[in-house]
Amino acid sequence: YSTSHPCFVSRPCLNGGTCHMLSRDTYECTCQVGFTGKECQWTDACLSHPCANGSTCTTVANQFSCKCLTGFTGQKCETDVNECDIPGHCQHGGTCLNLPGSYQCQCPQGFTGQYCDSLYVPCAPSPCVNGGTCRQTGDFTFECNCLPGFEGSTCERNIDDCPNHRCQNGGVCVDGVNTYNCRCPPQWTGQFCTEDVDECLLQPNACQNGGTCANRNGGYGCVCVNGWSGDDCSE
């Protein structure tokens, strides 16, 4: 039925679009870049990315249409909605602060929450992170007692333990929590590179031609026999 198919008879795909036969009398057009519509008859108005602030663009009859995210308005969603123009967002005398796409309430002492609608209790919930313990020091103040290895007003910072490190045998320091770890060269192991790697155990055939492997600090040696010599008794 190919010769009588609309793809060949009416050549419906415009502007260089490619026609695909779906059944005896149905088709689908794959449009060239810059065109859209069932028959590629419209210029793709979304090609120039006219929609701002994360909005979604659709093309209808050579025109674009932007679907705005909450907090934005305008034909291209270019205008920030000033939520603070509408009274009552922030309770208990909170100050409304307009932000791009949203707003924030700056609460008076004693109140908290998105709308300043909750009573502020310094340690409920605890602002202390990383296992820090919260202690209320006043009606609206607190202090965090941090676990070893952390610092900051809410224990948010892991103290860098590397400046005072003692990685041994060429180990390089990697910070941990209230300690440090060491990245060791191949001949050494252990958290601080103090343990010698036994190459004789790791490489049973380290010594050739009947040579005996002797582990040493930071390496190994071969004791050769029967006239053999060299690092691995291969000469």
């Epitope: 005072n164 003692r166 990685c167 041994q168 045998n169 060429g170 300690t179 958290q191 601080f192 600090n217």
Partner: antibody
């Protein structure tokens, strides 16, 4: 045989300067942490300064009591460790030892020590 | 800084006695502890490193033990040449810190 030999000690007035040297032999100098430790007469041992090895970019650490006054350095070509001591105080009077960190949590080689006396 | 509390500060003992010296650190030092012997007018000599490892050439009557914050040096049978001052030292992090020393004297 591992050997460390200090020199450069002597009598100096408060506020003066002195440079100690520690000539080493018998090991690959750049592979080891090197330390300066001092001991006032009849007192215990006090760590002064350290320079880490090549793998750790020869980074340097000082005790709080000498920071900004003393400078540790090394010359690999001469296998020598130095301690430049400026703004000396009477409490810096001590025998100064240079020592090698053996790589397993211990200072395994020490020099004979050199006496620094700070007095007017 | 890591504080080192060494005890006793002195001990009187006889040849053949068993002597124990302890060292406590203000935080976990992960077995990063060394023991030294020092005789008058001489440099310190490393006896034990890594809390329990005997340095080459040191007699086996010397032994070290411990982990975390508590460490011990034991001389199993005191010999005449062992009368000296002994120091512990943490090597886990800078600044390196030493114990105050223990003088082992003849009773």
């Amino acid at each position: 045989e591992v050997q460390l030999v200090e020199s450069g000690g002597g009598l100096v007035q408060p506020g003066g300067s002195l440079k100690l040297s520690c000539a080493v032999s018998g090991f690959t100098f750049s592979d080891f942490y090197m330390e300066w430790v001092r001991q006032a007469s009849g007192k215990g041992l006090e760590w002064v300064a350290a320079q880490r090895n090549k793998a750790n970019d020869f980074s340097i650490v000082y005790s709080a009591s000498v920071k900004d006054r003393f400078t540790i350095s090394r010359d690999d070509s001469k296998s020598t460790l130095y301690l430049q001591m400026n703004s000396l105080k009477t409490e810096d009077t001590a025998v100064y030892y240079c020592s090698r960190d053996g790589g397993k949590w211990g200072l395994d080689a020490w020099g004979q020590g050199t006496l620094v006396t700070v007095s007017s | 800084d890591i504080q080192m509390t060494q005890s006793p500060s002195s001990v009187s003992a006889s040849v053949g006695d068993r002597v124990t010296i302890t060292c406590q650190t203000s935080e976990d030092i992960y077995s990063g502890l060394a023991w030294y012997q020092q005789k008058p007018g001489k440099s310190p000599k490393l006896l034990i490193y890594g809390a329990s490892r005997l340095q080459d050439g040191v007699p086996s009557r010397f032994s070290g033990s411990g982990s975390g914050t508590d460490y011990t040096l034991t001389i199993s049978s005191l010999q005449p040449e062992d009368f000296a001052t002994y120091y512990c030292q943490q090597g886990f992090k800078y600044p390196l810190t030493f114990g105050g020393g223990t003088k082992v004297e003849i009773k």
